[in-house]
Structures are given as structure tokens and as C-alpha cells.
């Protein structure tokens, strides 16, 4: 004969395990329903009753099968220098990630909760390293024969033109000048502006429009000014 | 852009019924909340109760409890408020509000209002 | 229910002044779920502060919230003549939902 298929709630066997998005209540002792992402358990089970679920209260989320008695509280708006790349929803908590520009200074288990503006190198500085999702950009100085002329989180040292006859000689913020015959370059430039960190999540580079009646969907969080680094700016 | 259009003012007798309206636009009923607040004249701001326009799920203030009735139809965009059993002190501008889900219950867009006024 | 209460009930005060408003909430409420309200006569509310201390777009930076637990505050810095107007607090952090009686800021 084929076994009976129990229905919640039930008595598990001795020694047996209730199953799948099934939980065990201690008080009740039966195997009873867990409740479904989106939803907590608003009344636990009984020997005689299985468990009542009810959908996440506005701004609370439950992401797994489930038998807690309040959902999760979702994370505070983005702030301005955040972009939200997954919203808070009954089933899903808020991340907010850093913007362009910015970068994670302070993580979190899903998201970022402190982003910090990356470093500009200031002209004589180029980019040694560029800045990631996680970490600032390294400036250094530019070696004889290069320059930057920039204030920038992305340029690096470009090589002086060489010329037939110098005007004015490059240093290392600035390049060379020559007179009116056509200049040549020392090296292949190469990518003069290294590309911004790209984020391993689909970000929305632009946040909904804020109604002018209405709250925005963003606010600064005060980010304290970092010690500048050699070759860097507060800009 | 958001817009929240009520129905006109009225004037009801105690004891009547009044159904307010109120039309979105602009933008999708998923994940959002209507909510309906009254002000009576000169006083300050009251929660009446809120509605899932998606569900049509709501909630109110219990002293609403058996004469307030909020209704949705999604094909219109439209959601109801329907207050009965009106008596003078029922006498208020009433305004249907939205929250977006996940922002803490902040109404962020307001209806314009509608007057309703209880008089024998 | 959680009971707002604000205080003052009105203020008169000067373009430039500084002006502060209480809120005190009869228990704990989350400061995510606390937000301010700006009504001028004849107009809808707007939404002026949400999650305790966050502005709005629109809302000029002269504005700022605090607080935490049962006690909040709005601040204006230095009173324009646009700002003359009733703000209330309102709680969702359980329902039923309040409001504060309002705060009428007027010139002196």
C-alpha cells in the first residue's frame, strides 16, 4: 500500500525530520507549515491547526520560507550618493550600492552602508591604481618624461611630446611645448582616462526623479573628509 | 508626472453615506499604498485607514471600524473611500495620500482634497 | 495607540530666527517610520522630512529633523518667509497611524 501523505500538522516519526518548508514546533510537537517568502507566521500552529501566515507589514520583508513571528525590517532609504540597485519589497531587503564616482568605504552583507567620493589626483599626480567598487584610487607622481595636467579620478601620466625644437620644456604637470613643426610623442599615449569601476550588479545610473512635491529618494549621509593622500584632492 | 485627483465636495445629511474618489496617475499601483486622512476645519491631520490598491487589502483606525469601507479598481486607478452613518463632527476635508512600499509610510503625493460637509 | 504630541501648539518668531519643534511620542517609535509634514492654508500636506531627518527634494537645507526613541525635532536654522506655515509629525511605526496636533509657525 502506498504511505498516506500526512498533512500538516502532523506527528513526525520517531526520529524522523519534517519536510521540505516544514518546520518542527516544540510546543505543538508536530511537523507544520512554514510560511512563504513575503509573508511570517501571524499565528503559530497547534496540534489541531496549522500555521497562519500573513503578507510583510509595508517596509518589512521575509526573503526565505519562514516561521517568524514579525518579518525584517528593510534597510534605510539610499542616500544621495548611493544608487538603490535592488528595492525593498516583501520578499527583498533595499541594496544600495556607491554611484559612479564613489566608492564602498564601509560594506555590508548585501550592498554598501558608507560610500566615500574616490581620490582625484591633482596635476603632477596621475593614477597608479584605479579605484574599484571597494577601494579608492592611488595617485602617484608623474615620472620625468610625463605629465598630468588634471584634476581627475581616471587620468593617468601621458608621456611629453617630443619635439624638433622646445618652446618651453614639459615638467610634470605639464607638457611640452613646441615650436610651430609638427610635434611627435615619445610613446603611444594609450588610454589617456582609465574607465570608472565597473559594478558586478546592473546599476541604474540615474535615480528616479525626485517629485518636487515629495520626498526624493535620497539623502547625504555625512561622509567626514579623509586626509588627503600624496598627490590627491579634497575636490 | 504623479497626480492624485479626488471627486467634488458634498453635502450630506447625518445619517447618509458619502464615497469619495480618488485617480491616480503617473505612476504603477504595484507596491504602493493608498491612504485616506481627514482634517476637520481648523484641526489638524487624522488617519482614517489604508488600502493595497494590488490586494485590496486595507487597514483603519478602529474607531472607523464599521462605517469606513475602502475599495480599489485597478482598471481605472482608482481607489474609494466610503464613510456612512455620517453625523456633524464627520464635517472634513478628506484627502487620499500614496506611500510607496519600503518608504516607512511616508506620503509623499497628496490629492487635493475634498470637502464634505454633514449639515440637517 | 501611539500618541503624538507637539509642542508648541504655535509659535511666532522673525524672518532669521531660529526655530525648533518637538515631538514627543507616547512610546518608542523607529526613527525610519517618523516623518514631518508642511501645511499652508487652503493646500494638500507635503511631505517635508521623512525617516526622522532626511529632506525631500525641494525642501531647503535650512530644514533639519532629528532624534530617536520617543523624542524628535524639527529645525529651521533661519526662518524665511516661505516657512510660515503648520507642520505636523506623523508615526507608522504601528498602527494605528498618528499625527501630531500641529505646529502653526507665525510672524511675529
Known amino acids: 500500500l502506498p504511505a498516506q501523505v500526512a498533512f500538516t500538522p502532523y506527528a513526525p516519526e520517531p526520529g524522523g525530520t519534517c519536510r521540505l518548508r516544514e518546520y518542527y514546533d516544540q510546543t505543538a510537537q508536530m511537523c507544520c507549515s512554514k510560511c512563504p517568502p513575503g509573508q511570517h507566521a501571524k499565528v503559530f500552529c497547534t496540534k489541531t491547526s496549522d500555521t497562519v501566515c500573513d503578507s510583510c507589514e509595508d517596509s518589512t520583508y521575509t526573503q526565505l520560507w519562514n516561521w517568524v513571528p514579525e518579518c525584517l525590517s528593510c534597510g534605510s532609504r539610499c542616500s544621495s550618493d548611493q544608487v538603490e540597485t535592488q528595492a525593498c519589497t516583501r520578499e527583498q531587503n533595499r541594496i544600495c550600492t556607491c554611484r559612479p564616482g564613489w566608492y564602498c568605504a564601509l560594506s555590508k552583507q548585501e550592498g554598501c552602508r558608507l560610500c566615500a567620493q574616490l581620490r582625484k589626483c591633482r596635476p603632477g599626480f596621475g593614477v597608479a591604481r584605479p579605484g574599484t567598487e571597494t577601494s579608492d584610487v592611488v595617485c602617484k607622481p608623474c615620472a620625468p618624461g610625463t605629465f598630468s595636467n588634471t584634476t581627475s579620478s581616471t587620468d593617468i601620466c601621458r608621456p611629453h611630446q617630443i619635439c624638433h625644437v622646445v618652446a618651453i620644456p614639459g615638467n610634470a604637470s605639464m607638457d611640452a611645448v613646441c615650436t610651430s613643426t609638427s610635434p611627435t610623442r615619445s610613446m603611444a599615449p594609450g588610454a589617456v582616462h582609465l574607465p570608472q569601476p565597473v559594478s558586478t550588479r546592473s546599476q541604474h545610473t540615474q535615480p528616479t526623479p525626485a517629485p518636487s512635491t515629495a520626498p526624493g529618494t535620497s539623502f547625504l549621509l555625512p561622509v567626514g573628509p579623509s586626509p588627503p593622500a600624496e598627490g590627491s584632492t579634497g575636490d | 508626472q504623479v497626480q492624485l485627483v479626488q471627486s467634488g465636495a458634498e453635502v450630506k445629511k447625518p445619517g447618509a453615506s458619502v464615497k469619495v474618489s480618488c485617480k491616480a496617475s503617473?505612476?504603477?499601483?504595484?507596491?504602493?499604498?493608498m491612504h485616506w486622512v481627514r482634517q476637520a476645519p481648523g484641526q489638524g491631520l487624522e488617519w482614517i485607514g489604508r488600502?493595497?490598491?494590488?490586494?485590496?487589502?486595507?487597514k483603519h483606525d478602529p474607531k472607523f471600524q464599521d462605517r469606513v469601507t475602502m475599495t480599489s479598481d485597478t482598471s481605472t486607478n482608482t481607489v474609494y473611500m466610503e464613510l456612512s452613518s455620517l453625523r456633524s463632527e464627520d464635517t472634513a476635508v478628506y484627502y487620499c495620500?500614496?506611500?510607496?512600499?519600503?518608504?516607512?509610510?511616508?506620503?509623499?503625493?497628496w490629492g487635493q482634497g475634498t470637502l464634505v460637509t454633514v449639515s440637517s | 495607540d501611539i500618541q503624538m504630541t507637539q509642542s508648541p501648539s504655535s509659535l511666532s518668531a522673525s524672518v532669521g530666527d531660529r526655530v525648533t519643534i518637538t515631538c514627543t511620542a507616547s512610546s518608542s517609535v523607529s526613527s525610519n517610520y517618523l516623518h514631518w509634514y508642511q501645511q499652508k492654508p487652503g493646500s494638500s500636506p507635503k511631505l517635508w522630512i521623512y525617516?526622522?531627518?532626511n529632506l525631500p527634494s525641494g525642501v531647503p537645507s535650512r530644514f533639519s529633523g532629528s532624534g530617536s526613541g520617543t523624542d524628535f525635532t524639527l529645525t529651521i536654522s533661519s526662518l524665511q518667509p516661505e516657512d510660515f506655515a503648520t507642520y505636523y509629525c506623523h508615526q507608522y511605526h504601528r498602527s494605528p497611524w498618528t499625527f501630531g496636533q500641529g505646529t502653526k509657525v507665525e510672524i511675529k
Open positions: 495620500a500614496r506611500s510607496p512600499y519600503g518608504d516607512f509610510g511616508a506620503m509623499d503625493y
Open positions: 503617473g505612476f504603477n499601483n504595484k507596491d504602493i499604498y
Open positions: 525617516s526622522t531627518s
Open positions: 488600502i493595497d490598491p494590488a490586494t485590496g487589502n486595507t
